[in-house]
């Protein structure tokens, strides 16, 4: 996948929806300048492409939704990278620009004559991309052309700002909510001193900013905050881990507002540096319950507590997806490449045969082997349905009593579509209500996951709690097995009776040394000793002063 030739998946229709999925991994640092993408991705890529194709099939066969109108799509690869996604979005825009100059499908030539060449239909809206940083860049372009964008996993708080991102909506909540959930977990276990790491880019930066702001209000101190690129090299991750170890044994908890591949980079560095078990990672939904994050590095990940957007598996998607085969799946142009990558074999005689694999793919291979559905599948499908319901509502209001596209709806006005989309309210794929607030955001419901060793060399994610609109519920026994196992992440222990906290210059408020008050002093507050007035003495609990009883000396009393 280099910048010269980009593959596109098409599905014909009366109305075309664009989609940006990370079909391939982002370019490595040395390949960024040529925008050469990485390996093909299953969950974030191929599954989402197939979800789009199959969901549109379901919508098109539903007589109650957009009757007499066929939805089609144009799917492009974002490679989880802004430059690639922008390049692809320009292609969407180009289609729109050409189409707006059409007259009944005929393109006007320079000399004024008509050409019978029918250009591509315009893109009426875009689904995706997954990354917040990439979504922001794409939105900056799309909104210039009034093209609504519905995201399925871009959760950055910045995207709630409608003055900046007017044509952006999402079926997921803003990160402000999961930052709150992470702070609530830290509070629950009395972790008052934690290290912080975030992925460079909008998702990590704005999420961590919110986490730090909320932490400060709750009296939680950040030992140090670090940022790193998701595609940073081994040395960068090693350096980051060494910095984190400098805060041990006090800051054992590391809050990571990170993309999944950043977490994986940390786990790999933990292996190299011999740091398995030294930290407890508290991860955002970029990690969630992804096996591609922990595979091969389970020992390093054990104990990790992660936030996952509530989204049950979609059964009907698996029923469709698991039957797919390279011999019959021709509409997904990346499928053969994926099949060969997935099974590490060569599809002999196929157009995309990859000679780097020695083994030939046999006919018994099936996607059922080690199948894991994309954790955000429900959101991807809900985003597509949102676009369909928005178009449906728009058609109902612009074309009353008419089945199909009426003239009032042609060409589709992005401003009117946005209006219609914002009012959308329907039952999502998992039975939950899908609606948008005034910022185009959806409500926040999260599951709390814990990565555990379930048996010898068997590891898995266990659901240990939930966070629903501000309420945290946790099964502490499942996480810790016994109270004494709860990890401590504090800078200084509480002071003993008669001692005050002395915070060293330049230290955070959670780090102090305990100093005893003088013999004639009491603890006025946790930072101050005060001398008792003449004629009084500190009480036994050293929290105040008692008058010294007057003793009159008499002749014959022994010397004191």
């Amino acid at each position: 996948q280099s910048s010269e030739r980009r593959v596109v998946a098409h599905m014909p229709g009366d109305i075309i929806i664009g989609a940006l999925f990370s079909v391939h991994h982002q370019p490595t640092v040395d390949k960024v300048h040529e925008r050469k993408c990485g390996a093909v991705r299953e969950q974030y890529g191929i599954q989402r492409v197939e979800a789009m194709l199959h969901t549109l099939e379901r919508i098109n066969s539903d007589p109650t939704l957009l009757p007499n109108i066929t939805l089609g799509c144009e799917i492009r690869d974002s490679c989880w990278h802004s430059a690639v996604a922008l390049e692809q979005s320009i292609e969407f825009i180009r289609d729109s620009l050409i189409s707006s100059e059409e007259e009944e499908g005929l393109v006007r030539c320079v000399d004024g004559s008509s050409s019978s060449f029918r250009s591509k239909k315009p893109i009426v809206g875009v689904i995706g991309p997954g990354s917040s940083s990439v979504a922001i860049q794409v939105q900056n372009l799309l909104q210039l052309f009034n093209i609504p964008q519905i995201a399925y996993s871009a959760t950055s708080m910045d995207l709630s700002d409608k003055t900046l991102f007017k044509y952006f909506m999402r079926v997921v909540p803003s990160d402000a909510q999961q930052a709150r959930a992470m702070v609530d977990i830290v509070k629950r276990y009395n972790w008052t001193y934690v290290s912080a790491v975030h992925t460079e880019g909008n998702y990590g930066e704005s999420g961590m900013e919110a986490f730090k702001d909320m932490s400060a209000k709750e009296g939680i101190c950040i030992a140090h905050s670090y940022k790193i690129y998701s595609n940073a090299g081994e040395q960068s991750f090693d350096k980051l881990l060494k910095k984190l170890t400098s805060h041990l044994p006090k800051a054992r908890v590391v809050a990571c507002f990170c993309e999944g591949m950043t977490v994986r980079g940390l786990l790999m560095a933990m292996r190299r540096l011999g740091l398995a078990g030294e930290f407890l990672l508290l991860g955002s939904d970029g990690w969630a319950d992804r096996y591609d994050v922990t595979d091969g590095y389970q020992r390093e990940a054990v104990g990790g507590i992660t936030i996952k957007l509530q989204s049950p598996d979609v059964k009907w998607f698996d029923d469709y997806y698991l039957k797919l085969r390279p011999e019959t799946n021709h509409r997904n142009p990346w499928f053969q490449e994926f099949w060969q990558h997935r099974f590490q074999c060569r599809l002999e005689g196929f157009p995309q045969e990859n000679s780097k694999y020695n083994k030939t793919c046999n006919s018994s291979l099936t996607l059922k082997t080690h199948h894991v559905q994309d954790s955000k599948m429900g959101f991807v499908i809900n985003a597509i349905y949102s676009m369909a319901y928005g178009l449906h509502n728009m058609q109902m209001s612009l074309c009353p009593g008419y089945a199909g596209l009426c003239d009032a709806m042609k060409p589709i006005d992005g401003r009117k579509l946005l209006e219609s989309l914002m009012k959308t309210n329907f039952t999502g794929v998992s039975g939950d209500t899908i609606l948008f607030d005034e910022n185009g955001d959806s409500p926040g419901r999260y599951e709390i996951m814990n990565f555990k060793e379930m048996g010898k060399d068997y590891f898995d994610y266990i659901n240990v709690g939930s966070w629903d609109n501000g309420e945290l519920k946790m099964d502490d026994d499942e996480v810790w097995s016994k109270k004494s196992n709860i990890i401590r992440s504090v800078c200084s222990e509480p002071c003993e009776k008669g001692q005050i906290k002395v915070i060293r210059k330049g230290e955070v408020s959670c780090c102090w040394t305990c100093t005893p008050c003088k013999e004639n002093e009491y603890v006025f507050d946790e930072y101050t000793c005060k001398a008792c007035q003449l004629g009084s003495w500190p009480t036994d609990d050293l929290t105040g002063c008692d008058l010294i009883p007057v003793q009159y000396l008499r002749w014959g009393d022994p010397e004191p």
């Epitope: 081994e234 040395q235 090693d238 350096k239 060494k242 170890t245 400098s246 041990l248 044994p249 292996r271 190299r272 540096l273 011999g274 740091l275 078990g277 030294e278």
Partner: antibody, heavy 115, light 108 residues
Framework: SVEESGGRLVTPGTPLTLTCTVS????????LNWVRQAPGKGLEWIGI?????STYYANWAKGRFTISKTSTTVDLKMTSPTTEDTATYFC?????????????WGPGTLVTVSS | DMTQTPASVEVAVGGTVTIKCQAS??????LAWYQQKPGQPPRLLIY???NLASGVPSRFKGSGSGTEYTLTISDLECADAATYYC????????????FGGGTEVVVK
């Protein structure tokens, strides 16, 4: 400070435990290494016990040595010494809770393995 | 793991000596230098490839990055006669020896 003890003359195959006693700092805050030096030879890192209790060993030392600790002592157990294990053994405090720079060395204790 | 050169070097008082240390892979500047005199335990001179440990004179200078590191001692004094060792301080995992083989510095 750190101080080693337990070094003596042993016959090959006889298990031997060296003890490092620490004072002035807590083993729950620092990693503790064992390093040895054969007569006239260079320094050889054996292994480390982290503040958390995790242990790591040099590839050649795996299975031959075991490091363990209490609140104020760190033990190095030589499971089956050979004549090649004759050396001065140093107990060394790390500069952090894990593996880093060695900034506090004990005077060393001599182990002689001979038949 | 760590290759140190030369094994031995003889330098006149007031001269300069350069000792090199090469790691088998990048250690991201997590390198320390130690000085050891006969009958004594080693003493930390430099950490983080270039930071002087407390009480170490500025005549001792560490440099390098990635896999190549150098210790330079200028204005050599008789008291600098010792064996010098480098140590990778990055990881205890999969290590044969954290230390270099040592360089004996003889001051004439």
């Amino acid at each position: 400070s750190v101080e080693e003890s337990g070094g003596r003359l042993v016959t090959p195959g006889t298990p031997l435990t060296l003890t490092c006693t620490v004072s002035g700092f807590s083993l729950s805050d620092y990693g503790l290494n064992w390093v040895r030096q054969a007569p006239g030879k260079g320094l050889e890192w054996i292994g480390i016990i982290y503040a958390s209790g995790s242990t790591y060993y040099a590839n050649w030392a795996k299975g031959r040595f075991t490091i363990s600790k209490t609140s104020t002592t760190v033990d190095l157990k030589m499971t089956s010494p050979t004549t090649e294990d004759t050396a001065t053994y140093f107990c060394v405090r790390d500069s952090s809770a894990t593996y880093d720079y060695f900034n506090l060395w004990g005077p060393g204790t001599l182990v002689t393995v001979s038949s | 793991d760590m290759t140190q050169t030369p094994a031995s070097v003889e330098v006149a008082v007031g001269g300069t000596v350069t000792i090199k240390c090469q790691a088998s892979q990048s250690i991201s500047s997590y390198l320390a230098w130690y000085q050891q005199k006969p009958g004594q335990p080693p003493r930390l001179l430099i950490y983080g490839a270039s930071n002087l440990a407390s009480g170490v004179p500025s005549r001792f200078k560490g440099s390098g990055s990635g896999t190549e590191y150098t210790l330079t001692i200028s204005d050599l004094e008789c008291a600098d006669a010792a064996t010098y060792y480098c140590q990778q301080a990055l990881s205890p995992s999969n290590v044969d020896n954290a230390f270099g083989g040592g360089t004996e510095v003889v001051v004439k």
